[in-house]
């Protein structure tokens, strides 16, 4: 009876269980009734980080100096290269694919502390009664317009991203 499932670190092919290739190696040929799975080590600047049946290794990430990137940790046959930014610059994401001098605060957030040479911008959510409708690296949350002081009434409520909309009071006849 041919198997329908295989053990861990195996895969099912042609009704039989073959061993997966270990991290750092790629698949050359599947096992047969008479032969083991054939695997080959990844080449220079390549890697595979899991037990696999991949026929091609992945290229190591390139830390492009034109984007302000440099190598934080060199890749191996089992791990990808880890990039970081030049000193004084900040990664734009976990994957660190580009660098910015400092982050900006998105709409709905205000700048709590402007970036310095040693610390990035600190953002804070706009509390009730305040808003920010821009991305900025220096602007704080702004208070909602006070309609009452203009002898107007609130026609549309404000949010953390929008100001209130004021309008004329309904006059009683």
């Amino acid at each position: 009876e041919p198997p329908t499932a295989c053990r861990e670190k195996q895969y099912l092919i042609n009704s039989q269980c073959c061993s997966l290739c270990q991290p750092g190696q790629k698949l050359v040929s599947d096992c047969t009734e008479f032969t083991e799975t054939e695997c080959l080590p990844c080449g220079e600047s390549e890697f595979l980080d899991t037990w696999n049946r991949e026929t091609h290794c992945h290229q190591h990430k390139y830390c492009d100096p034109n984007l302000g990137l440099r190598v934080q940790q060199k890749g191996t046959s089992e791990t990808d290269t880890i990039c970081t930014c030049e000193e004084g610059w900040h990664c734009t994401s976990e994957a660190c694919e580009s660098c910015v001098l400092h982050r900006s605060c998105s709409p709905g957030f205000g700048v709590k502390q402007i970036a310095t040479g040693v610390s990035d911008t600190i953002c804070e959510p706009c509390p009730v009664g305040f808003f920010s409708n821009v991305s900025s690296a220096f602007e704080k949350c702004h208070p909602w317009t006070s309609c009452e002081t203009k002898d107007l009434v609130v026609q549309q409520a404000g949010t953390n991203k929008t100001d209130v909309v004021c309008g004329p009071q309904d006059r009683l006849r």
Partner: nanobody, 116 residues
């Protein structure tokens, strides 16, 4: 492609004035917050001044408050920094930068030297 071209630097005596310009192209200038950032010899980058897209709100570092004025002309796609009462410690390469400050979007800068 974003291009920022700074100009107006030079040698000036302490107490003197300079006006820096930054000609922007490759993006919709009027939509972006803009900054002046400087780097003194052997030092890190220092944020000097910023201006919102409409030119209605500004920021100044404490070290330049009352002496420097940032402005912009959205019809000319140009950012300015008027620098008065210059001091030796203002000597630096001055860069203009646009949000969100990508490394590859920086210009070459313009050198300001304050010396007698």
């Amino acid at each position: 492609e974003v291009q920022l071209l700074e100009s107006g630097g030079g040698l000036v005596q302490p107490g003197g004035s300079l006006r820096l310009s930054c000609a922007a192209s490759g993006f919709t200038f009027r939509d972006y917050e803009m900054w002046w950032v400087r780097q003194a010899p052997g030092k890190g980058l220092e944020r000097v001044s910023a201006i919102n897209p409409q030119g209605t709100r500004t920021y100044y570092a404490d070290s330049v408050k009352g002496r420097f004025t940032i402005s912009r002309d959205n019809s000319k796609n140009t950012l300015y920094l008027q620098m008065n009462s210059l001091r030796a410690e203002d000597t630096a390469v001055y860069y203009c930068a646009k949000l969100p400050f990508y490394f590859q979007e920086w210009g070459q800068g313009t050198l300001v030297t304050v010396s007698s």
